[in-house]
Amino acid sequence: CDLPQTHSLGNRRALILLAQMGRISPFSCLKDRHDFGFPQEEFDGNQFQKAQAISVLHEMIQQTFNLFSTKDSSATWEQSLLEKFSTELNQQLNDLEACVIQEVGVEETPLMNVDSILAVKKYFQRITLYLTEKKYSPCAWEVVRAEIMRSFSLSKIFQERLRRKE
């Protein structure tokens, strides 16, 4: 499965949609910025087999999809952009799932790195907690949008590293 080819374009499209979703000036939200502790070490990728790497990417995209599928999200973002973004994420999830299935039998190692997936889950829990504490304010969502863009950019680098490994 040539993951990066199918996935990189989708990742770029998702990033562009996220960029377009901004509704308020981020400069009015400087005081709301927060360190969510992105699990960078899980995206360094050296210790992973390909199927494990794909499962971590899948978890990140699944969690992003869940986050932007909430009613609070629908109340914040422009509907047509949100729908396009969700469709893009859904397509990426399908691509990744197909990839994982192809990798079964190719590798002897377990399909999932449980610790890495847990780290990604906890990262998104911190994001959700922050939004709750900030009462889903426009600035809180703006901070989260920037964080997700940053994490997508980092996962893009991760995918490029996977491509080089191939």
Partner: antibody
Framework: QVQLQESGTVLARPGASVKMSCKAS????????MHWVKQRPGQGLEWIGV????????TYNQKFKDKAKLTAVTSANTAYMELSSLTNEDSAVYFC?????????????WGQGTTVTVSS | DIVLTQSPASLAVSLGQRATISCRAS??????????MHWYQQKPGQTPKLLIY???NLESGVPARFSGSGSGTDFTLNIHPVEEEDAATYYC?????????FGSGTKLEIK
């Protein structure tokens, strides 16, 4: 690769206006904020303001609010800064710089600078 | 506006030794786990180059002899061991609040 190409040296009279350009290539111009920074000869750096080419949203350093006007033309992948009512204090090198890491607001790529000389 | 005071204004360090540059902010630039202080290097006739972001994160491609530390109002850039090519002016910049400001610069000379 990412490049920011700025317009050449400008010589202007006091009281006049100048408009400089910054042509971006090698990345998605509409999805990165673009900062402008001033550097007077032998001196430090001053942040002028920032523009988001995707929607034209701008934020200024209050000190430059009545001095600088930032615009962008997405079809040309070009950002512009117009300086008005020029005085000797405006003689400087002006850099356009790409915002980096989203809301960390650092600057990773810099144009080569446009030199503005104000003289009668 | 937050004022960034860099010290010393200039320093001369022998090849292979340690250079330490300080940047003090008039108000805290740290919030919720991040310190919004960044460091740049500018060589004569060149544009500034990002070295360190968020006080201690090394920018990709920057040699590991550069390191940053600090939080709140006090920040430090260390270069060890210093090499000839490190002769430049170093600036700190904060993005804690508007307007973003830069320090006045520290000129590093290699002995």
């Amino acid at each position: 690769q990412v490049q920011l190409q700025e317009s050449g040296t400008v010589l202007a009279r006091p009281g006049a206006s100048v408009k400089m350009s910054c042509k971006a290539s090698g990345y998605s111009f509409t999805t990165y904020w673009m900062h402008w920074v001033k550097q007077r000869p032998g001196q430090g750096l001053e942040w002028i303001g920032v523009i988001y080419p995707g929607n034209g949203d701008t934020t200024y350093n209050q000190k430059f609010k009545d001095k600088a006007k930032l615009t962008a033309v997405t079809s040309a992948n070009t950002a512009y800064m117009e300086l008005s009512s020029l005085t000797n204090e405006d003689s400087a090198v002006y850099f356009c710089t790409r915002n980096y890491k989203y809301d960390y607001y650092t600057m990773d790529y810099w144009g080569q600078g446009t030199t503005v000389t104000v003289s009668s | 506006d937050i004022v960034l005071t860099q010290s010393p204004a200039s320093l001369a360090v022998s090849l292979g030794q340690r250079a330490t540059i300080s940047c003090r902010a008039s108000k805290s630039v740290s919030t919720s786990g991040h310190s919004y202080m960044h460091w740049y290097q500018q060589k004569p006739g060149q544009t500034p180059k990002l070295l360190i972001y968020l006080a201690s994160n090394l920018e990709s491609g920057v040699p590991a002899r550069f390191s940053g530390s600090g939080s709140g109002t006090d920040f430090t850039l260390n270069i060890h061991p210093v090499e000839e090519e490190d002769a430049a002016t170093y600036y700190c910049q904060h993005s804690g609040e508007l307007p973003f400001t830069f320090g006045s610069g520290t000129k590093l000379e290699i002995k």
